[in-house]
Interface confidence: low
């Protein structure tokens, strides 16, 4: 699972699978966003 | 104007204790997720502990070279950043960077200080 | 750990020419990558997230892309500020890991 502070944002957004917040090996999210340090 | 300003490095034996402050001004501090980020001198970026912001309950996570001697905290009322050493050793020898991040959705922000060199010899 | 490897460790080139850099995930990363550029002396600076944003205020020349365990980081007409060095980052997974570097040097 995908718990890092781009990924709660993303989780947050609804844009992370919602079976347990997992991301599929398929699953590329949309660019907005993601973390930086 | 953002600033970043790290403070408390130095020179202490292996085994001794520093404590590292970051003193945040010109943004929401207490929204933003901060990480400590180190450099060995000549060498590459190393991630080194992460606390989260106030409405994620400010919660941590660390690298495992760290884990067990380092805690990081915050104090949103102060605007302040802290890294609590202990155990330090040879290796842990670098300039500790702060690094400030926060979504906003639609784009990111990203700030880091200038750094504070800790030294761990003998 | 998600382990980055960066390619190539130095480049030598020459300002005007593009600059192509790689980086490569031990394990699949989707598109949570960014690029730094340091200069000797200063801290790191960031000009690319989520594997293809540019960030604020960083000149368009600088392109990223990829996604998966593949990444690249372009600079399309390299300026004399540009030589440094550019390391690449995940934030995929705890720790955070970042590449090795790789040196940009003028030729």
């Known amino acids: 699972a995908c718990d890092t502070a781009t990924c709660v944002t993303h989780r947050l957004a609804g844009l992370l699978s919602r079976s347990g917040g997992v991301v599929k090996n398929n699953f590329v999210p949309t660019n907005v966003g993601s973390k930086a340090f | 104007e953002v600033q970043l300003v790290e403070s408390g490095g130095g020179l202490v034996q292996p085994g001794g204790s520093l404590r590292l402050s970051c003193a945040a001004s010109?943004?929401?501090?207490?929204?933003?997720?901060i990480s400590w980020v180190r450099q060995a001198p000549g060498k590459g970026l190393e991630w080194v502990a992460e606390i989260r912001s106030e409405s994620d309950a400010s919660a941590t996570h660390y690298a495992e070279a760290v884990k067990g001697r380092f805690t990081i905290s915050r104090d949103n009322a102060k605007n302040s950043l802290y890294l609590q050493m202990n155990s330090l050793r040879a290796e842990d020898t670098a300039v500790y960077y702060c690094t400030a991040y926060f979504d906003y959705g639609l784009a990111i922000q990203n700030y880091w200080g200038q750094g504070t060199l800790v030294t761990v010899s003998s | 750990e998600i382990v980055l490897t960066q390619s190539p460790a130095t480049l030598s080139l020459s300002p005007g020419e593009r600059a192509t850099l790689s980086c490569k995930a031990s394990k699949w990363v989707t598109t949570y990558v960014s690029w730094y550029q340091q200069k000797p002396g200063q801290a790191p600076r960031l000009l690319i997230y989520g594997a293809s944003n540019r960030y604020l205020g960083i000149p368009a020349r600088f392109s990223g892309s990829g996604s998966g365990t593949d990444f690249t980081l372009t600079i399309s007409s390299l300026e004399p500020e540009d030589f440094a060095v550019y390391y690449c980052s995940q934030s995929y997974n705890y720790p955070y890991t970042f590449g090795q570097g790789t040196k940009l040097e003028i030729k």
């Open positions: 010109g943004f929401t501090f207490s929204n933003y997720w």
